[in-house]
């Protein structure tokens, strides 16, 4: 009786089992009693990346500078292109296929985790005794000044956004 | 591309035992089941024996059982076919055919699609 | 060993079609039996024409023209080849083949004149 199933990278067609074409290769003519499945490379700037019985490969994923990408890893027959971001710039989705800026921490905040090609800036609330003055994709929150370390007093307190502003002991206290 | 070529073949007397060889390229021997075919003079085809692609089975037509023996060395890409207590009956010209693929599932190695030119075993006191 | 029918000759002019019989004795299914053609030329070895055992599982041998095909006739349990279109190189003894029993089984072949 014709099998119902077949073994590991084989599938059933006219009532027998042909092996799959290995990653990398396409399928050009099914196996027949007397003859195995007949494969062939895909060609230059195609893929496959599983056992397969696809008569065409995949195109190389194009990384479009226009839209802000460039190539992090180069595809072979057996992978697709892996696409980045330029500088600055990061994915919009898991599968990059468009950027958009990195965005910048507003004053009383501080970047927690720098942006990468692939992921936006993180920024975080400026906690107390810290600000942040600036608009920023870079700056991390920053301590407020101490003015005992300077020999100085607080003459005006610090908030998330400024720093304290520090100024010269009252000698008439002493 | 795919061939078959016999040899062994030759004038016998009755009693006596014959080896025919058959060297396969231009495929891969290994994945194949082979046959031995034989046509008397002016007859039909008779199928003497069929050995799988990695010799684990073989099967005979009624009138060689115990007597012929088919076999295979796959690191040297060829058939055999041992025969003994030949009879004038068995003259013939013998072919060596191709088999199924062992991806085919069990039992299907026994059509044929390649043919040798054969090789002429004649039996004769 | 059950060795399945042919007529032993069969006459045709060219253009028109034959088909040739293989009748495999009851208690052999038809239906579902692989049956096998080849056609043999004098001098030369045979060579495979075709496998069928139904139109989802068959085979054409390679170079084989499509004017050969199989087909089978259930009513009288035989397996058909059809040969549309008859020309002076398919005078030929065609033989069919199946597999019983743990033995291959040949017909005893048809031989096919080409008239004229």
């Known amino acids: 009786e014709p099998p119902t199933a077949c073994r590991e990278k084989q599938y059933l067609i006219n009532s027998q089992c042909c092996s799959l074409c290995q990653p990398g290769q396409k399928l050009v003519s099914d196996c027949t009693e007397f003859t195995e499945t007949e494969c062939l490379p895909c060609g230059e700037s195609e893929f496959l990346d599983t056992w397969n019985r696809e008569t065409r490969c995949h195109q190389h994923k194009y990384c479009d500078p226009n839209l802000g990408l460039r190539v992090q890893q180069k595809g072979t027959s057996e992978t697709d292109t892996i696409c980045t971001c330029e500088e600055g710039l990061h994915c919009t989705s898991e599968s990059c296929e468009s950027c958009v800026p990195h965005r910048s921490c507003l004053p009383g905040f501080g970047v927690k985790q720098i942006a990468t090609g692939v992921s936006d800036t993180i920024c975080e609330p400026c906690p107390v005794g810290f600000f942040s003055n600036v608009s920023s994709a870079f700056e991390k929150c920053r301590p407020w000044t101490s003015c005992e370390t300077k020999d100085l007093v607080v003459q005006q307190a610090g908030t998330n956004k400024t720093d304290v502003v520090c100024g010269p002991q009252d000698r008439q206290r002493a | 591309q795919v061939q078959l070529v016999e040899s062994g073949g030759g004038v016998v007397q009755p009693g006596r035992s014959l080896r025919l060889s058959c060297a396969a390229s231009g495929f891969t021997f290994s994945s194949h089941g082979m046959h031995w075919v034989r046509q008397p003079p002016g007859k039909g085809l008779e199928w003497v024996a069929v050995i799988w692609y990695d010799g684990s089975n073989e099967y005979y037509g009624d009138s060689v059982k115990g007597r012929f023996t088919i076999s295979r060395d796959n690191s040297k890409n060829t058939l055999y076919l041992q025969m003994n207590s030949l009879r004038v009956e068995d003259t013939a010209v013998y072919y060596c055919?191709?088999?199924?693929?062992?991806?085919?599932?069990?039992?299907?190695?026994?059509?044929?699609?390649?043919w040798g030119q054969g090789t002429t075993v004649t039996v004769s006191s | 060993q059950a060795v399945p029918t042919q007529p032993s000759s069969l006459s045709a002019s060219p253009g028109a079609s034959a088909s040739l019989t293989c009748t495999l004795r009851?208690?052999?299914?038809?239906?579902?039996?692989?049956i096998y053609w080849y056609q043999q030329k004098p001098g030369s070895p045979p060579q495979f024409l075709l496998r069928y055992t139904s139109d989802s599982d068959k085979l054409q041998g390679s170079g084989v023209p499509s004017r050969f095909s199989g087909s089978k006739d259930a009513s009288a349990n035989a397996g058909l080849l059809l040969i549309s279109g008859l020309q002076s190189e398919d005078e030929a003894d065609y033989y069919c083949?199946?597999?019983?029993?743990?033995?291959?089984?040949f017909g005893g072949g048809t031989k096919l004149t080409v008239l004229g």
């Open positions: 083949m199946i597999w019983h029993s743990s033995a291959v089984v």
């Open positions: 009851s208690g052999i299914n038809v239906g579902s039996s692989r």
């Open positions: 055919t191709r088999g199924g693929g062992h991806w085919n599932y069990e039992g299907h190695y026994y059509g044929m699609d390649v």
